[in-house]
């Protein structure tokens, strides 16, 4: 019924169906940091733990342009890319290039994508068109995943699941074209 | 898989209301805009707004201003369409769509057939 | 409200052919223009978004061209499963308007 998974020629790679196409990866303007995030206390012996939190993982920070067809967003937005092997937190370098990767022999653990966050971000069109708003999903932070064998791929997928919020009040709306009022960017996590 | 799920259809009087329900899975829907297209029978879709279920921003196509009121309930993820004040002219399929856009529709709901008659 | 003419209304084709609907805005639309498929008792899908870009998993049979006022939505090879209606939209002012549509059926 659905549409097959295609890699069409514009500037998306599509993912499969029911999936939104990630903004392609115009690093304009990038600043990347690096950091390592997510370490919790040592482990006693690095092939013994059972705990992930133990591990530590990587998290680049890229600042880049929103753009769909011909419009850009008005303010680069930050994301997450979630980087490199996880081993446990004291023994992992501080920056890409000191420092030697520490590697298990043990089992196989991931830095993927945790948690995820929708930034609403304004774009700036040609030809003084009407007001447009994008929405982009946005890594908020990077985990530890355990691989086994009997894991495949699709682990790395692994989207978080956002605890149920009530709605915020709703203003009321004399007029119609908030859209260009509206400039706040929105950041909320799940 | 994304998906909407709509409500029945509904069979009302001129002058009264309506409220259509669309139940979204597959993201939270507070991470994309919702809209709302209706047609006719046998004719063409018609545009009638946008909501972002973030904050309760709203955008309606001026023919519906002041007879539509779209809102979100994201502890459910379902958004709402009521139409008041009906006439017979408002008979139409309504469709529910959502997208990471304020511009295009990515994906449908199934529709809900609303009958105004006397 | 920016007018969206649409033309043929509808045509008869086979499969295999190659078939050519076209999309007339009333002023410049720059490329802000979408392409949905609708069956019957169906909801529309997007197929073609800003005029030219194909959205998740469109089959590379569907192509989209056109800017300012003049657009156009080509089939290369007609599948059976395309036999539908075809609507464009565009987005380029408010509010948001369709085409009429393009009913494609077998020939």
């Known amino acids: 019924q659905g549409w097959q998974a295609f890699k069409n020629d514009a500037t998306e790679i599509i993912p499969e169906l029911g999936e939104y196409p990630e903004p392609p990866p115009e690093l304009e303007n990038n600043k990347t940091m690096n950091r390592a995030e997510n370490g919790g206390r040592p482990p006693h012996h690095p092939f013994e733990t059972k705990d992930v939190s133990e591990y530590s993982c990587r998290e680049l920070h890229f600042t880049r342009y929103v753009t769909d067809g011909p419009c850009r967003s008005a303010k680069p937005v930050t994301e997450l890319v979630c980087s490199g092997q996880c081993g446990p937190a004291r023994l992992l370098p501080n920056a890409i290039g000191r420092g030697k990767w520490w590697r298990p022999s043990g089992p196989d653990f991931r830095c993927i994508p945790d948690r995820y966050r929708a930034q609403r971000v304004q774009l700036l069109c040609p030809g003084g068109e009407a007001p447009r708003a994008r929405k982009v999903r946005l890594v908020a932070s990077c985990k530890c995943k355990r691989l086994t064998r009997f894991h495949n791929q699709s682990e790395l997928k692994d989207f978080g699941t956002e605890a149920a919020r009530p709605q915020k009040g709703r203003k009321p709306r004399p007029r119609a074209r908030s859209a260009k009022a509206n400039q706040a960017e929105l950041e909320n996590a799940y | 898989q994304v998906q909407l799920v709509q409500s029945g259809a509904e069979v009302k009087k001129p002058g009264a209301s309506v409220k259509v329900s669309c139940k979204v899975s597959?993201?939270?829907?507070?991470?994309?805009?919702q809209h709302w297209v209706r047609q006719a029978p046998g004719k063409g879709l018609e545009w009638m707004g946008w909501?972002?279920?973030?904050?309760?921003?709203?955008e309606y196509a001026s023919k519906f201003q002041g007879r539509v009121t779209m809102t979100e309930d994201t502890s459910t993820d379902t958004a709402y369409m009521e139409l008041s004040s009906l006439r017979s002219e408002d008979t139409a399929v309504y469709y529910c769509?959502?997208?990471?856009?304020?511009?295009?529709?990515?994906?449908w709901g199934q529709g809900t057939t609303v009958t105004v008659s006397s | 409200d920016i007018q969206m003419t649409q033309s043929p209304s509808s045509l008869s084709a086979s499969v295999g052919d190659r078939v050519t609907i076209t999309c007339k805005a009333s002023?410049?639309?720059?490329?802000?223009v979408a392409w949905y498929q609708q069956k019957p008792g169906k909801a529309p899908k997007l197929l073609i978004y800003?005029?030219?870009t194909r959205w998740t998993g469109v089959p590379s049979r569907f192509s989209g061209s056109g800017s300012g006022t003049d657009f156009t939505l080509t089939i290369s090879s007609l599948q059976p499963e395309d036999f539908a209606t075809y609507y464009c939209q565009q987005y380029s002012d408010y509010h948001w308007t369709f085409g009429g549509g393009t009913k494609v059926e077998i020939k």
């Open positions: 597959g993201f939270p829907i507070k991470h994309h805009f």
């Open positions: 909501s972002d279920p973030e904050i309760g921003d709203t």
């Open positions: 002023q410049d639309v720059h490329t802000a």
């Open positions: 769509a959502t997208g990471d856009t304020t511009y295009k529709f990515d994906f």
């Open positions: 800003w005029a030219s």
